[in-house]
């Protein structure tokens, strides 16, 4: 029905009010529900209304606004502190103590986060995004700096249908179309061999407690596992001679252990360094990611932070010790 300048939608009636013509819905059943477009964000509940915008949102704290789009910091919440002497004593000993695995305690001084004390350092969201890893999409955390809300905004629940088969045939130079999907790791790029690589800037440098020969033997599974967490593909970097950059890692004993060693005589043979694991240099190849997703890592900084976030959650399937992102071509250092 015509309402002067205002065009009313199907099923609505025009009502002339003191503040001018308004559309009104006499029976919400006959009108388009404003809730159909799910306007209420951050878990707010939507209630149909008879007047524009034909819905009202009941917001869950700390959100407000007509669509629960505004974050309001609770007024009297003091900044969280890590008060416990227990955590001060246990930080940076190489062991993750769950009681200290919090943002306020720097994730047990980095012990729970692959030595990265603040994976969300570049996240400028008003939300504390580390507290919003909750199997729900929180758009305010859905940015690369905030680690894509742990990929909770893009059907994180999708699992690889033929997981065992796809794991066995990952990166075997044969394209298996049933495995050529994001959740199956795009078959390790076996179906994209004819496409140009799309490398993220930088290098992921990971220390893992597996000797080089064991890691190389298990490389396909290792790359698939990390690629699944990062929703992209990884490969081991090659040096200028074309050799895979996987080197023995001799470990860094905790400060307490170093002190203990200095206060007693070395035993015969103790000087010989023992291989504790591997230092592996990885590159991110986004050639498939960019075709299927807008959640790809342009550089390795946020990818390293996301792996640290998984360490915090205890969802890593390999014994990673540390992860760093190197921007320049790395020297071969131990």
């Amino acid at each position: 029905s015509s309402c002067g300048q205002v065009k009313c939608r199907k099923g609505e009636q025009c009502v002339h009010t003191a503040s001018g013509p308004r559309c009104f819905c006499p029976s919400p059943r006959d009108c388009e529900s404003g809730c159909a477009s799910s306007p209420c964000q951050h878990g707010g509940s939507c209630h149909p209304q008879r007047q524009p915008p034909y819905y009202s949102c009941q917001c869950a704290p700390p959100f407000s606004g007509s669509r629960c789009e505004l974050y309001t910091a609770p007024p009297s919440t003091p900044p969280a502190t890590c008060l416990s002497q227990y955590c001060a004593d246990k930080a940076r000993d190489g062991v993750c103590d769950e009681a200290c695995n919090s943002h306020a305690c720097q994730w047990d001084g980095g012990d729970c986060s692959l030595t990265m004390e603040n994976p969300w350092a570049n996240c400028s969201s008003p939300l504390p995004c580390w507290d919003y890893i909750n199997n729900q999409c929180d758009e305010l955390c859905n940015t690369v700096e905030c680690l894509f809300d742990n990929f909770e905004c893009q059907g994180n629940s999708k699992t690889c249908k033929y997981d065992k088969y796809c794991a066995d045939h990952f990166k075997d130079n044969h394209c298996d179309q049933g495995c050529n999907s994001e959740e199956c790791g795009w078959d390790g790029l076996d179906c994209a061999a004819d496409q140009p690589e799309n490398l993220a800037e930088g290098t992921l440098v990971i220390v893992v407690l597996m000797p080089p020969e064991q890691l190389l033997q298990d490389a396909r599974s290792f790359l698939r596992a990390l690629g699944t967490l990062l929703h992209t593909n990884l490969r081991i970097k090659r040096d200028s001679q074309g050799e895979l950059m996987v080197y023995p890692y001799y470990g860094e004993k905790s400060a307490a252990m170093k002190k203990q060693r200095m206060t007693r005589r070395s035993l015969p043979g103790e000087q010989e360094q023992e291989v504790a694991g591997s230092k592996v240099f990885l590159e991110i190849d986004n050639r498939q990611c960019v075709q299927d997703s807008d959640h790809c890592f342009k550089n390795t900084d946020a990818a390293a932070a996301l792996l640290a976030s998984h360490a915090i959650q205890g969802t890593l399937s390999y014994p990673l010790v540390s992860v760093v992102s190197e921007s320049l071509t790395p020297e071969r250092t131990q």
Epitope: E98, D111, L209, M257, V321
Partner: antibody
């Protein structure tokens, strides 16, 4: 197959010392934390100590702090419990147990040894 | 230290019975709780971790629930091999602590 085998238990006088060994096989020893847990005759389980072999970090129950020392030799895939100033109340079966969560003390113990009996008596 | 209190300390039941054992913590350990089964002369065996996840090879008749301070182990239909002592354990913070045990005996 992941396996833990304890040895070194026996009879010792109060004030004496004993060193228990726990030989691990079937997994990367340095990657997982290891605890010693004891059980006095007819009693419940009591956690004694924890070590993460890779970093060498150690944790102790108050009842043994200053008397017991946990250590690990990654070249031998073996954890040790050096027990000094032993008391009658230390009499128990001592089990070594692997933690399931790599570097996390905050993880369950998923593999246990068969236990070794320590008797402290004059 | 977190004290763990199990109840009952012992119970008698028949094959096929549903058995419930509870464990209460003196302070919250979120879901960092495990249940172990021990038979006489044997080492403990991990049944449940993370309060409700079954360890590998553990039959589905064993289930765990709870979070915070109150936890439950349920055996839906008791089998002859289930007669044993059951322990809960928190692994949220050191020192790691166990409940005193619940002995499940044949009625």
């Amino acid at each position: 197959e992941v396996q833990l085998v304890e040895s070194g238990g026996g009879l010792v006088q109060p004030g004496g010392s004993l060193r228990l060994s726990c030989a691990a096989s079937g997994y990367t020893f340095s990657s997982y934390g290891m605890s010693w847990v004891r059980q006095a005759p007819g009693k419940g389980l009591e956690w004694v100590s924890y070590i993460y072999p890779y970093s060498g970090a150690t944790y102790y129950a108050d009842s043994v702090k200053g008397r017991f020392t946990i250590s690990a030799d990654t070249s031998k895939n073996t954890a040790y419990l050096q027990m000094n100033s032993l008391r009658a109340e230390d009499t128990a079966v001592y089990y070594c147990a692997r933690h399931s969560g790599y570097y996390r003390i905050s993880s369950a113990m998923d593999v246990w040894g068969q236990g070794t009996l320590v008797t402290v008596s004059s | 230290d977190i004290q763990m209190t199990q109840s009952p300390s012992s119970l008698s039941a028949s094959v096929g019975d549903r058995v419930t054992i509870t464990c209460r913590a003196s302070q919250s350990n979120r879901r960092f709780l495990a249940w172990y089964q021990q038979k006489p002369g044997k080492a403990p065996k991990l049944l449940i971790y993370g309060a409700s996840s079954r360890a590998s090879g553990v039959p589905s008749r064993f289930s765990g629930s709870g979070s915070g301070t109150d936890f439950t182990l349920t055996i839906s239909s008791l089998q002859p091999e289930d007669f044993a002592t059951y322990y809960c354990q928190q692994y949220y913070i050191s020192p790691l602590t166990f409940g005193q045990g619940t002995k499940v005996e044949i009625k």
